[in-house]
């Protein structure tokens, strides 16, 4: 297959040499990470028409350009440039949904209202979903035994740079009312340090995004307090509307009643609010 | 900082062709390069693009897959081979430089001034 | 498919032009499209990205506009050394380019 005939043409170049090498406080790259990638890109690319043209050959080429032979505290976004550039993939306007420490949950959602889109949902993050990866600086082998951590190593290493890039893109191409969904149970339900907080929600663009509605997701079953009026959810709407963007939040009491109305509206409890 | 293609020639049909571009003032590292075409009296037509800073990444409009290639032979030189070739080939092809910066991609602030490919019995 | 309305358009130095762009799918972010001037035996010169940026050394007598598939360039006070076939240019997913058919403009 496609992917035998690319993965045997680089077998020398990933396999693993008895040497010295930097020790990271984090774990080592996923296993088979190649072979993941690709693979994702694969399936990504043949379940979704507007995708099917790109090249998963050059997609992997782009990606492991961005890391490998580069010392792995130094990543910049602009390694990531080419790799953003064949992801570049557009969600229509109301069909944007952030999550904040959430994503079990935005992505339930998004499986079952399937025309609305996490990052996740793309193909730069279904590519990256739940992997680690990095590489060493002067050599073309991936580091399996360890990648540095964010908060005892570096902050600019290849997973957290990633991350940080293709959200930044996300927000900056997202428009009419995006939405996003926060943890009710967090003590700080939105936090400025977190992805959203600190690169999302200042790359929205005003020009065309209309408004921000932040879904706050409870977690107590008898939870009935009115957490949009939580400090960091006004600390929220400050921010967005100094951007000249609406706000609007709603408290979602239930969210397994929420999940389930989405999956049933017609359902004749679903009438009443969640 | 310019570019110029060379070339452009007139072949018969099912020959083959390869078309340089050349940098003048800077480097190809880090910048994409693209491939775009004018059939006489038509509008503009993208064909392939490459971005060569350690390793190639390239890419191909659906219609050159397979037939065109694109290529770094150095740092101020792209290629652009072109098999099987017919009349509906036949067309001004120009090189351009995409806008730096990752905000920016996706335009091309400079242009060369094309080369002539004809293709005819 | 971008489509570009007029494909030819007259007028007088001093007047307006008003030329129009539709995509037939939204381009990348909704405004990643841009606009270039091709004057004959010259290489296209980029005038505007990101549907209402200007490059770089262009007159503010060029102004763009639109969003999501539809898009306008207006060039304002039009002089003659404006006489040039303009293209609109959309970026789209996975990287790929598309350009509408062209609009010759003549200034009288």
């Known amino acids: 297959s496609g992917l035998n005939d690319i993965f045997e043409a680089q077998k020398i170049e990933w396999h693993e040499l008895p040497r010295w090498r930097q020790q990271w406080s984090g774990s080592g790259t996923t296993s088979r990470f190649p072979e993941t990638v690709l693979a994702r890109c694969v399936k990504y690319t043949e379940v979704h028409p507007e995708m099917r043209h790109v090249d998963c050959q050059s997609v992997w080429d782009a990606f492991k350009g961005a890391f490998i032979s580069k010392y792995p505290c130094n990543i910049t976004e602009e390694d990531y440039q080419p790799l953003v550039k064949l992801g570049t993939q557009t969600v229509p306007c109301n069909k944007t949904l952030l999550w904040s420490r959430i994503k079990d949950l935005a992505h339930q959602f998004t499986q079952v209202q399937r025309d609305m889109f996490t990052l996740e949902d793309m193909l730069l993050g279904y590519l990256a979903d739940d992997l680690t990866w990095c590489g060493e600086f002067n050599t073309f082998e991936i580091n399996y035994q360890s990648c540095p951590d964010w908060r005892k190593d570096c902050s600019n290493n290849p997973v957290s740079v990633f991350w940080k890039t293709v959200s930044r893109r996300f927000a900056e191409t997202a428009c009419g009312v995006v939405h996003v969904m926060l943890n009710g149970s967090r003590s700080k339900i939105f936090d400025k340090n977190s992805t959203f907080g600190s690169v999302e929600v200042h790359n929205l663009q005003p020009e065309k995004v209309q408004a921000l509605e932040a879904w706050v997701i409870h977690g107590g079953r008898e939870d009935s307090r009115d957490l949009c009026q939580d400090p960091t959810i006004k600390e929220l709407e400050s921010i967005i509307s100094k951007r000249n963007i609406r706000f609007f939040c709603k408290n979602i009491y239930r969210p397994d009643k929420f999940l389930q109305c989405v999956k049933n509206p017609e359902d004749s409890s679903c009438l009443s609010g969640i | 900082q310019s570019l110029e293609e060379s070339g452009g020639d007139l072949v018969k049909p099912g020959a083959s062709l390869t078309l340089t571009c050349t940098a003048s003032?800077?480097?190809?590292?880090?910048?994409?390069i693209c491939w775009i075409r004018q059939a006489p009296g038509k509008g503009l037509e993208w064909v392939a693009c490459?971005?060569?800073?350690?390793?190639?990444?390239k890419y191909y409009a659906n219609w050159a897959k397979g037939r065109f290639t694109v290529s770094k032979t150095s740092s101020t030189t792209v290629t652009l081979q072109m098999t099987s070739l017919t009349g509906a080939d036949t067309a001004t092809y120009f090189c351009?430089?995409?806008?730096?910066?990752?905000?920016?991609?996706?335009?091309?602030?400079?242009w060369g001034p094309g080369t002539l490919v004809t293709v005819s019995s | 498919v971008l489509t570009q309305t007029p494909s030819s358009v007259s007028a007088a130095v001093g007047g307006t032009v008003t030329i129009n762009c539709q995509c037939s799918?939204?381009?990348?972010?909704?405004?990643?499209l841009a606009w270039y001037q091709h004057k004959p035996g010259q290489p296209p010169k980029l005038l505007m990205y990101r549907a209402s940026n200007l490059a770089s050394g262009v007159p503010s007598r060029f102004k763009g506009s639109g969003s999501g598939s539809q898009f306008t360039l207006t060039i304002g006070e039009v002089q003659s050394d404006d006489a040039a076939t303009y293209y609109c240019?959309?970026?789209?997913?996975?990287?790929?380019?598309?350009f509408g058919g062209g609009t010759e403009v003549v200034v009288r």
């Open positions: 003032g800077f480097s190809f590292n880090n910048y994409w």
């Open positions: 240019q959309g970026y789209y997913n996975g990287g790929s380019y598309a």
């Open positions: 799918q939204s381009v990348y972010g909704h405004n990643w």
């Open positions: 351009a430089r995409e806008l730096s910066g990752s905000s920016y991609e996706g335009y091309f602030e400079s």
């Open positions: 490459i971005y060569s800073p350690s390793g190639d990444i």
